[in-house]
């Protein structure tokens, strides 16, 4: 039996800059019942506060609802582990909510086979930003990637589209079925998961010409 090992805050994420969650790895419990508490302060402020909600985001987490989330302020967050033999505190984690956004994937993915005047066929991929993000006002600047592969292929082909919400894919094989997904990433933030898979078959009666 011993004091608890040092916990580590390993991840903080926000879906929308309005709420966020931080998760920690507990470290060893020293073979004893161990309590964990997360405390935080904000830069330039002297007060220290305890986690407002340990339940919403599951074990070893702290959820900050709208009421407790400020942007343009750096949070200094630590986790303390205590058992009857002693206590241990994590290194402080400095968090700016505007840098930890992991949005929902883009929505309304649409696929359309089109043909140019020279009879060259392409797949026109279009999508919309995730619902939660207010891209028009510049509250979020979003970058996108699409990935596609034929049903038989093992590897995805990834295209970075910048801020564009549409993309044309050329040199596809007639008669093949293609799977397509999109994801997005805000400035400074994290890539969303890949969105729902859509598929389309390139018709055989379109002829590809180089």
């Amino acid at each position: 039996q011993s004091p608890p090992g040092k916990p580590e805050i390993h991840k903080c994420r926000s879906p929308d800059k309005e709420t966020f969650t931080c998760w920690w790895n507990p470290g060893s419990d020293g073979g004893l019942p161990t309590n964990y508490s997360l405390t935080y302060s904000k830069e330039g402020e002297k007060n220290t506060y305890e986690c407002p909600d340990y339940k919403t985001s599951g074990p070893n987490s702290c959820f900050f609802s709208k009421q407790y989330t400020s942007i343009w302020k750096i949070y200094i967050i630590t986790v303390n582990a205590t058992n009857e033999m002693g206590s241990s505190t994590s290194d402080p984690l400095y968090v700016d909510v505007t840098y930890i956004v992991e949005p929902e994937p883009p929505r309304n993915l649409t696929l359309e086979v089109k043909q140019l005047k020279d009879k060259k066929t392409y797949l026109w991929v279009k999508w919309l930003p995730p619902t939660i993000t207010d891209v028009k006002t510049g509250w979020f600047t979003m970058e996108y990637e699409i990935r596609l592969k034929s049903e038989e292929a093992d590897e995805w082909e990834i295209h970075f589209t910048g801020h564009q919400t549409q993309f044309k894919v050329f040199d596809l094989y007639p008669g093949q079925k293609y799977l397509v997904q999109t994801r997005c990433k805000p400035d400074h933030g994290y890539w969303s998961r890949w969105g729902q898979e859509k598929s389309i078959e390139i018709p055989n009666d379109f002829t590809l010409k180089d």
């Epitope: 580590e8 991840k11 750096i74 984690l93 400095y94 700016d96 840098y99 994290y190």
Partner: antibody
Framework: QVQLQQPGAELVMPGSSVKLSCKAS????????MHWVKQRPGQGLEWIGE????????NYNQKFKDKATLTVDKSSSTAYMQLSSLTSEDSAVYYC?????????????WGQGTLVTVSA | DIVMTQSQKFMSTTVGDRVSITCKAS??????VAWYQQKPGQSPKLLIY???NRYTGVPDRFTDSGSGTDFTLTISNLQSEDLADYFC?????????FGGGTKLEIK
């Protein structure tokens, strides 16, 4: 405790490439962005670029876009920077530096630096 | 690119002095400025972030004032271990840039 381990020195030929390593320990490698900074003898500091070890997303200083390539190996918690087409201008100390938190780019932990000498 | 100018390359000081090191940004950077200390043969060490916040473990004799384009790192009651190079850095817009450094020397 947090440590960023870098080899002390590399002697390389002009025109060749070198791959510098930075082994991180004492924290979860994928949590923080890693940066690379150049310092020529007796001179100031120049930011080369940054990489997010969680997904290898990177940003570069345009000045180093064709010179440096940043990669990571999550399994060994190691960040790498490859420098290509080396000239005497590339002789410098190169530091890896960990982002201070989940936020803006200030650097709370630095490696000891690798001195790269480009010489025939 | 934003240029960070530290006009004093060298400053002669005495132990116990109050020293002010200045840094000027070529464009508005808000409070997105950090300060580092570098001793000979060592890597830089973070002192201040967000223009005025001392990093964990940094003695309170180090303070920063300023926002916008003009920043000053003040060391009160200078200690011999404070003799080093000091660099400012902006992280307001890419690429992140550093000042040229100010070296504190003994008179």
């Amino acid at each position: 405790q947090v440590q960023l381990q870098q080899p002390g020195a590399e002697l390389v030929m002009p025109g060749s490439s070198v791959k510098l390593s930075c082994k991180a320990s004492g924290y979860t490698f994928t949590t923080y962005w890693m940066h690379w900074v150049k310092q020529r003898p007796g001179q100031g500091l120049e930011w080369i670029g940054e990489i997010d070890p969680s997904d290898s997303y990177s940003n570069y200083n345009q000045k180093f876009k064709d010179k440096a390539t940043l990669t990571v190996d999550k399994s060994s918690s190691t960040a790498y920077m490859q420098l290509s087409s080396l000239t005497s201008e590339d002789s410098a100390v190169y530091y890896c530096a960990r982002n201070g938190g989940l936020g803006p780019a200030w650097f709370s932990y630095w490696g000891q630096g690798t001195l790269v000498t480009v010489s025939a | 690119d934003i240029v960070m100018t530290q006009s004093q390359k060298f400053m002669s000081t005495t132990v116990g002095d109050r020293v002010s090191i200045t840094c000027k940004a070529s464009q508005y950077v808000g409070t997105a400025v950090a300060w580092y200390q570098q001793k000979p043969g060592q890597s830089p060490k973070l002192l201040i972030y967000s223009a005025s916040n001392r990093y964990t473990g940094v003695p309170d004799r180090f303070t920063d004032s300023g926002s916008g384009t003009d920043f000053t790192l003040t060391i009160s009651n200078l200690q011999s271990e404070d003799l080093a190079d000091y660099f400012c850095q902006q992280y307001s817009s890419y690429p992140w840039t550093f000042g040229g450094g100010t070296k504190l020397e003994i008179k």
